[in-house]
């Protein structure tokens, strides 16, 4: 379960890939789209508002008791949408919700390197959010080896 | 309960080796990452090497890079320092450590071990 | 790297004063800082995380706050078993560093 209702911390930054592509988020047709690409020298980059909560692992699951944390993570582009896991289509979309928001709005924040965070789906254990064919999507990681693989891995930049 | 026992340390003459060990129990040691930490007499503390939680990865300040190594058994739940190429600087207690939260390094670091005293000295 | 800068490196104080430590970044950075508190002989003790967060079991006397450059632990009402040696570190952008320790002594 979620630690209480509100964020330990919020932090506004840019997305980019483990390439340097950055995320940017588009306006079209009333609704947002998602889109990976490389920016023009001095292009704005879109920021991101991620917002950190505390979640007990279940004692029964981890083995810790009351110390098993994890950390997950909300991403909001622009005010009332959120980043969210289909797992049924394996895409990212983003979605207008008020709060609470739904699980599929969740992700256990990841470091699989100094410099790089990775999101996997609260909904669905070992799914992450990666890059496929320039877009955001649902990739299922099947080894811990594969956790190292660079199209889910992220980087957080203030700049 | 949390528990870190680090072992190993001792008197060791300069261009020498040593391992230390950090016996971890408690936890679910494989969902953590790991660090240790050093502190020189009457010094403040010092960040020596960091470890995912799968031991996939390894990180360490310039002081210490090429000469130490970071690793991790997670079925025996045990981290490792190599130590080579030891140098009078590197005269310290070394304290394992462990990340706040399952799979990444947020937080800081929660639980300690006592420490293990490391004197490089001829 | 990111150089963490303590202040006061020592003061003196006594039972129920208020005491402010300071911990000054070399560049921004997200809030991932957190206060040990060490006492001689032994390890240290992690008091707060995320910049203001209270880690479980710390008195709530203790309380941080600070974001970017500019980072403080405050002990509201100091009692003797507060007088021990405080440190700040980022662990933000590696390498991860400490600040250079700030000891707290009886008046």
């Known amino acids: 379960s979620i630690t209480g209702i509100s964020p330990i911390t919020e932090y506004l930054a840019s997305l980019s890939t483990y390439n340097d592509q950055s995320i940017t988020f588009a306006l079209e047709d009333e609704s947002y789209e998602i889109y990976v690409e490389d920016l023009k020298k001095d292009e704005k980059k879109d920021k991101v508002l991620l917002s950190y909560y505390e979640s007990q692992h279940p004692s029964n699951e981890s083995g810790d008791g009351v110390d098993g944390k994890m950390l997950m993570v909300t991403l909001s582009p622009t005010k009332d949408f959120w980043l969210h896991a289909n797992n049924k289509e394996h895409s990212v979309e983003l979605h207008k919700c008020e709060k609470p928001l739904p699980d599929q709005a969740f992700f256990v924040l990841h470091n699989m390197h100094s410099n790089c965070v990775s999101f996997e789906c609260k909904t669905d254990p070992g799914v992450f959010i990666g890059v496929k064919d320039n877009h955001l999507a649902l990739i299922k990681v099947d080894s811990s080896e594969n956790l190292c693989t660079e199209n889910i891995l992220f980087k957080l930049s203030e700049t | 309960e949390v528990q870190l026992v680090e072992s190993g340390g001792g008197l060791v003459q300069p261009g020498g080796s040593l391992r230390l060990s950090c016996a971890a129990s408690g936890f679910t040691f494989n969902n953590y990452w790991m660090t240790w930490v050093r502190q020189a007499p009457g010094k403040g503390l010092e960040w020596v090497a960091s470890?995912?939680?799968?031991?996939?990865?390894?990180y360490y300040p310039d002081s210490v890079k090429g000469r130490f190594t970071i690793s991790r058994d997670n079925a025996k739940s045990s981290l490792y320092l190599q130590m080579n190429s030891l140098r009078a600087e590197d005269t310290a207690v070394y304290y394992c450590?462990?990340?706040?939260?399952?799979?990444?390094?947020?937080?800081?670091?929660?639980?300690w071990g006592q420490g293990t005293l490391v004197t490089v000295s001829s | 790297d990111i150089q963490m800068t303590q202040s006061p490196s020592s003061l003196s104080a006594s039972v129920g004063d208020r005491v402010t430590i300071t911990c000054l970044a070399s560049?921004?950075?997200?809030?991932?800082l957190a206060w040990y508190q060490q006492k001689p002989g032994k390890a240290p003790k992690s008091l707060i995380y995320?910049?203001?967060r209270l880690q479980d079991g710390v008195p709530s006397r203790f309380s941080g706050s600070g974001s970017g450059t500019d980072f403080t632990l405050t002990i509201s009402s100091l009692q003797p078993e507060d007088f021990a040696t405080y440190f700040c570190q980022q662990g933000s952008k590696y390498p991860l560093t400490f600040g250079g320790g700030t000891k707290v002594e009886i008046k």
């Open positions: 470890i995912t939680y799968t031991g996939g990865g390894t």
């Open positions: 560049e921004g950075f997200s809030n991932d």
């Open positions: 995320a910049a203001s």
């Open positions: 450590t462990r990340a706040n939260y399952y799979y990444n390094t947020y937080g800081g670091f929660p639980y």
